[in-house]
């Protein structure tokens, strides 16, 4: 059984739920942003296509000491089938421009909302 209202034994989280929770966390970050997110830290932008979740994690995992994105980092690791370490970039990850973490989060959020609307949960 999957978890129904907290009473049944916990099971795997459905992909739709995991994606919705990630979107909610990114919304939370963007709405609660008072000072520049992660003090203006810059990360590699990503191609929002194949391997997007691992690529997003590869970029964000390099940012340390930014509590605002720690939950996002953990959630993204659940979408990425392999372990990602700081400084590790897959061949799919083209490093061509860096953007502020705040912009990265906004871009990712817009794309994830689109995927959710289209029913692409994996």
């Amino acid at each position: 059984l999957t978890c129904l209202g907290g009473f049944a034994s916990p099971g795997p989280v459905p992909p739709s739920t995991a994606l919705r929770e990630l979107i909610e966390e990114l919304v939370n970050i963007t709405q609660n942003q008072k000072a520049p997110l992660c003090n203006g830290s810059m990360v590699w932008s990503i191609n929002l296509t194949a391997g997007m979740y691992c690529a997003a994690l590869e970029s964000l995992i390099n940012v340390s000491g930014c509590s605002a994105i720690e939950k996002t980092q953990r959630m993204l690791s659940g979408f990425c089938p392999h372990k990602v370490s700081a400084g590790q970039f897959s061949s799919l990850h083209v490093r061509d421009t860096k953007i502020e973490v705040a912009q990265f989060v906004k871009d990712l959020l817009l794309h994830l909302k689109k995927l959710f609307r289209e029913g692409q949960f994996n």
């Epitope: 520049p36 003090n39 810059m42 340390s64 930014c66 400084g87």
Partner: nanobody, 116 residues
Amino acid sequence: EVQLLESGGGLVQPGGSLRLSCAASGFTFRDYEMDWVRQAPGKGLEWVSSIGPSGSETWYADSVKGRFTISRDNSKNTLYLQMNSLRAEDTAVYYCAKAYTGFGYWGQGTLVTVSS
């Protein structure tokens, strides 16, 4: 404590050159990727260039590709940015940054003004 101190900025005519330097201390410089970031008057932050820990990997924004060269001397804990064929749109405060850290770990910046 991480400290980054930029120098080399100034007023230069369009088409001219400048070399920015950044002296780093308070961390093991040779272990870290480094960035140059700029902020034009009234604009947001713009990434300019990055260099890998050893100096063998370099990356550039399209706006500066072919004109700017990033380099580092790990024996001197110093980062450089050679800027050639400067344009008015390159006018900005240039910051040296330890990659993936916020501006709490950046230098105070050096102003580059390109004007005739």
